[in-house]
């Protein structure tokens, strides 16, 4: 989905390259082609990253942290390409890299600033704690510190409780919001400004449904067009809350178009799925089916949560028997 890295051109022979944690990047450097090519890449003007001269690599004094992680584009050196291919970048690799290139004609020095970002796909969770209901937007690993914003019915809200834990190379962030007793829709946005990547979580509470035992219920779940892109891989999960925890009824993977159903009374309409409508039917309701039903549509860029509350009441026959 994302390019290897992207470059921002800034003056004075200096470029900024933005990479993602654990991915490979290219530090660009070019020169006027000539013979007797010597290439030295250094980090922070101190550590040897890669050396090439007399037609081959010379890595005897390479700093150990770069061992087996760097290479040049050997077939392109003669064409003036001194770029460095850099494997599995970490946050410790952030900083200034200097590329020295000497030829029979000239010496040039290029500087490349490497910035590394992390953005493991966030999640939006709905939790019950005693009598309270919470929405939690969380991201397990993110760097730099993201911007988190909440909206209620499309209006920004200032309450933004953020629980943050920092590890050696990234932050783990939870942003809980108490939504007890609310019928509003909520939206949480997490933005990584470095990677220019935004994730949105949206939560909608549908009106409660009252059904009789043995009837069937149809619960709607359609993605909001603003977020939904059918070309992007996503997953749809229907689950039911029981005793404060959710159990999965069924799920659908867009990549394989597989549907897995764990509850025999659950049904999905294939034709509707093809139209990106993930509404479901639950047949032959019984009293224990009362509760909250959650539809979760998730991709790398969004999570859409739809909550239905279903009340199953005894049918007349059942009531008269009692």
């Amino acid at each position: 989905i994302f390019p290897l890295a992207f470059f921002i051109y800034v003056p004075m022979n200096e470029q900024i390259v933005i990479g993602r944690l654990d991915e490979d990047i290219i530090l660009p450097s070019s020169f006027e082609r000539g013979s007797e090519v010597v290439i030295h890449w250094k980090y922070q003007d101190s550590y040897k990253v890669h050396s090439y001269y007399k037609g081959s690599d010379h890595l005897e004094s390479q700093d150990p942290r770069y061992a087996n992680r760097t290479s040049l584009f050997y077939n392109e050196i003669q064409n003036g390409n001194a770029s460095l291919f850099f494997r599995r970048v970490s946050l410790l690799d952030e900083g200034i890299y200097t590329c020295y290139v000497g030829t029979a004609i000239q010496v040039i020095t290029n500087k490349v600033v490497l910035k590394v970002g992390v953005f493991l796909t966030p999640v939006m969770k709905y939790e019950k704690r005693n009598t309270n209901s919470f929405l939690i937007c969380s991201v397990l690993s993110v760097y730099p510190r993201p911007i988190i914003t909440w909206k209620m019915d499309n209006t920004p809200i200032s309450e933004n409780n953020m629980e943050e834990t920092g590890s050696l190379d990234s932050f783990s962030i939870n942003s809980p919001l108490n939504i007890t007793g609310s019928n509003s829709s909520y939206e949480c946005t997490i933005e990584n400004s470095l990677l220019k990547q935004t994730w949105t979580g949206r939560w909608t509470m549908k009106d409660g449904l009252h059904k009789m035992q043995s009837e069937h219920v149809s619960l709607s779940c359609q993605p909001v067009n603003d977020y939904f892109s059918p070309n992007q891989d996503f997953k749809v999960t229907w689950s039911r809350m029981k005793s404060g925890t959710f159990s999965v009824l069924a799920y659908y993977l867009s990549s394989s178009q597989n549907t897995i159903i764990n509850e025999s009374r659950f049904s999905w309409n294939k034709e509707l799925i093809n139209q990106s409508d993930f509404s479901m039917n639950l047949m032959d309701l019984n009293l224990s089916d009362s509760g909250e039903y959650l539809c979760n549509i998730s991709s790398d860029e969004y999570t859409l949560l739809t909550i239905h509350t279903v009340h199953v009441e005894p049918s007349q026959e059942t009531a008269s028997h009692n």
Epitope: V38, H40, Y53, K54, G55, H58, G102, T103, A104, T109
Partner: antibody, heavy 121, light 107 residues
């Protein structure tokens, strides 16, 4: 134009020390590796030492390793060769010479005029 | 260390002659060989690098060839100004070593 000017030569007794200097001009000093090469009177050329453009790498001929130290000051465009425990066989004209580039290539594109070091009791 | 052996040690030739100097390495040095000219009382001057590449500003009558262990410097038409001692030098690996020199005299 590129200029390398050696200084500091003279007569010194065996076992004593001497410091040679090389002043560079006409090019970006910090971009190039510099070597010392010597030539005993009436003899051939002998490579002595090299220091890379950034001072990160230094290499010496076996005959001087442990006695001679090469250094540079990029802010002053100067190269030095500190010669300790001098021997009679160190008597030579000492040339500083600029590498093609960083110091890694190992051949000598520009030479100074040389400074004579005589080790004699 | 890699030993470099030049031959002949001394060479006498006439103006206009084609002159060849040979340099042999004790082990393969690929093409990492340079040739220098040193006139009496002067510093050496680079003529050829990478066995056959002519340094900028050097007259085209000078040429180099060879690879591995056998190398030659050729002056296609000797000029009076070419009176000098010529040195080969390997830069394949530390320590860099020179041949003992070939003194070229004009008849």
């Amino acid at each position: 134009q590129v200029q390398l000017v050696e200084s500091g030569g003279g007569v010194v007794q065996p076992g004593r020390s001497l410091r040679l200097s090389c002043a560079a001009s006409g090019f970006t000093f910090s971009d190039y590796g510099i070597h010392w090469v010597r030539q005993a009177p009436g003899k051939g050329l002998e490579w002595v030492a090299v220091i890379w453009y950034d001072g990160s790498d230094k290499y010496y001929a076996d005959s001087v390793r442990g006695r001679f130290t090469i250094s540079r000051d990029n802010s002053k465009n100067t190269l030095s060769l500190q010669m300790n425990s001098l021997r009679v066989e160190d008597t030579a004209v000492y040339y500083c010479a600029r590498d093609r580039s960083s110091g890694a290539m190992g051949y000598f594109v520009y030479w100074g005029q040389g400074t004579l070091v005589t080790v004699s009791s | 260390d890699i030993q470099m052996t030049q031959s002949p040690s001394t060479l006498s030739a006439s103006v206009g002659d084609r002159v060849t100097i040979t340099c042999r390495a004790s082990q393969s040095i690929s093409s990492w060989l340079a040739w220098y000219q040193q006139k009496p009382g002067k510093a050496p001057k680079l003529l050829i690098y990478k066995a056959s590449s002519l340094e900028s500003g050097v007259p085209s009558r000078f040429s180099g060839s060879g690879s591995g262990t056998e190398f030659t410097l050729t002056i296609s038409s000797l000029q009076p100004d070419d009176l000098a001692t010529y040195y080969c030098q390997q830069y394949n690996s530390y320590s860099y070593t020179f041949g003992q020199g070939t003194k070229l005299e004009i008849k």
